[in-house]
């Protein structure tokens, strides 16, 4: 089942998704879509990166972290109730059926009548505590012409990491880190 995240109407929502590039600049394509991940790619794409840069985005959706270091967490600006639903983060690791996909459920709550004086944004994040690590042998490795030869070797979880104090006071989340290389 999807991991659930919460935000209030009018605030920014944060959906975590991470991978670790094999080397600086060795980026992999990532897409974010509204709706669960389909068999390939993303449905209703709101943002995507390629091997170099963010190459497609729609209004209100952006990457606040350093995507060049693998932080492809999605920020949705000024959310409304219509932003509720499932979002897909797909990390398109080159090779044979190597994609990692995460379905994240965003729940938008009505704004509080009396806003709290200190903590104005309520984000909860509870990524799965354990993700499966897959072995990769020669049969599952593909050398690419223009892309780096990248293997997925480790998946780890980050728990309650304090992130991005500019986005919100005491914003805490846990995300999935995919280590490549």
């Amino acid at each position: 089942s999807e991991v659930e995240y919460r935000a209030e109407v009018g605030q920014n929502a944060y959906l975590p998704c991470f991978y670790t590039p094999a080397a600086p600049g060795n980026l992999v394509p990532v897409c974010w879509g509204k709706g669960a991940c389909p068999v390939f790619e993303c449905g209703n794409v709101v943002l995507r990166t390629d091997e170099r840069d963010v190459n497609y985005w729609t209004s209100r959706y952006w990457l606040n972290g350093d995507f060049r270091k693998g932080d492809v967490s999605l920020t949705i600006e000024n959310v409304t109730l219509a932003d509720s639903g499932i979002y897909c983060c797909r990390i398109q690791i080159p090779g044979i059926m190597n994609d990692e996909k995460f379905n994240l459920k965003l729940v938008i709550k009505p704004a509080k009548v009396t806003p709290a004086p200190t903590r104005q944004r309520d984000f909860t994040a509870a990524f799965p505590r354990m993700l499966t690590t897959r072995g990769h042998g020669p049969a599952e490795t593909q050398t690419l012409g223009s892309l780096p030869d990248i293997n997925l070797t480790q998946i780890s979880t980050l728990a309650n990491e304090l992130r991005d104090s500019r986005l919100a006071n005491d914003l805490r989340d846990s995300g999935a880190t995919i280590r490549i290389g």
């Epitope: 669960a36 389909p38 790619e41 449905g43 090779g95 690419l144």
Partner: antibody, heavy 121, light 107 residues
Framework: EVMLMESGGGLVKLGGSLKLSCAAS????????MSWVRQTPEKRLEWVAT????????YYPDSVKDRFTISRDNAKNTLYLQMSSLNSEDTAVYYC??????????????WGQGTSVTVSS | SIVMTQTPKFMSTSVGDRVSVTCKAS??????VAWYQQKPGQSPKPLIY???TRHTGVPARFTGSGSGTDFTLTISNVQSEDLAEYFC?????????FGAGTKLELK
């Protein structure tokens, strides 16, 4: 006009190999995922393989995963399917198809006319 | 893998009729369902994606509906050129799978 033209089909012996090609024109080939789909003599459609626009990612069902290889040459606007260890269940018409993905993944919005592969014992 | 059970296998109709073909997925597939039309001797032609969105150029008499596990393709005011075989497909999870087809014939 979008055109997909398959070639390379024919009669092949059990356990043999064959390489199919699909020449694409009328669109920016490197901006689309591409797939192979086959249709059995009983008219059932079966997905065979898909490749990302750059060629970096490939996808297969278990039935062909270790025997078939999808590849592409974006400079030549051509899609390939290398098939080995062929058996009677691989007898089918093989279609190549285009998969838009950039703003919304949509499966197979254009199909070629197909090329027939018959595996004989 | 997800099985797409398509019914009926054959359907007899007359020009002007309204007909419906159904597909039932063995697991939840959201709205990741497409419909294809195949005329004899031709390759499949896409009609519908995302369960209900018509491809460019597809006449409005073709309507897709459903979500989750149950999906329907409806052809209102059937025309003679609609006599063909129709296939559903799910693209929610790997492997992408097709229904067995429904052949639309004239009475």
């Amino acid at each position: 006009e979008v055109m997909l033209m398959e070639s390379g089909g024919g009669l092949v012996k059990l356990g043999g190999s064959l390489k199919l090609s699909c020449a694409a024109s009328g669109f920016t080939f490197s901006s689309y995922y591409m797939s192979w789909v086959r249709q059995t003599p009983e008219k059932r459609l079966e997905w065979v393989a898909t490749i990302s626009n750059s060629g970096g990612s490939t996808y297969y069902p278990d039935s062909v995963k270790d025997r078939f290889t999808i590849s592409r040459d974006n400079a030549k606007n051509t899609l390939y399917l290398q098939m080995s260890s062929l058996n009677s269940e691989d007898t089918a018409v093989y279609y190549c198809a285009r998969d838009p993905y950039y703003t919304n993944y949509v499966p197979m919005d254009y199909w070629g006319q197909g090329t027939s592969v018959t595996v004989s014992s | 893998s997800i099985v797409m059970t398509q019914t009926p296998k054959f359907m007899s109709t007359s020009v002007g009729d309204r007909v419906s073909v159904t597909c039932k997925a063995s697991q939840y597939v959201d709205t990741y369902v497409a419909w294809y039309q195949q005329k004899p001797g031709q390759s499949p032609k896409p009609l519908i994606y995302s369960a209900s969105t018509r491809h460019t150029g597809v006449p409005a008499r073709f309507t897709g509906s459903g979500s989750g596990t149950d999906f329907t393709l409806t052809i209102s005011n059937v025309q003679s050129e609609d006599l063909a075989e129709y296939f559903c497909a799910q693209y929610s999870s790997s492997p992408l799978t097709f229904g067995a087809g429904t052949k639309l014939e004239l009475k």
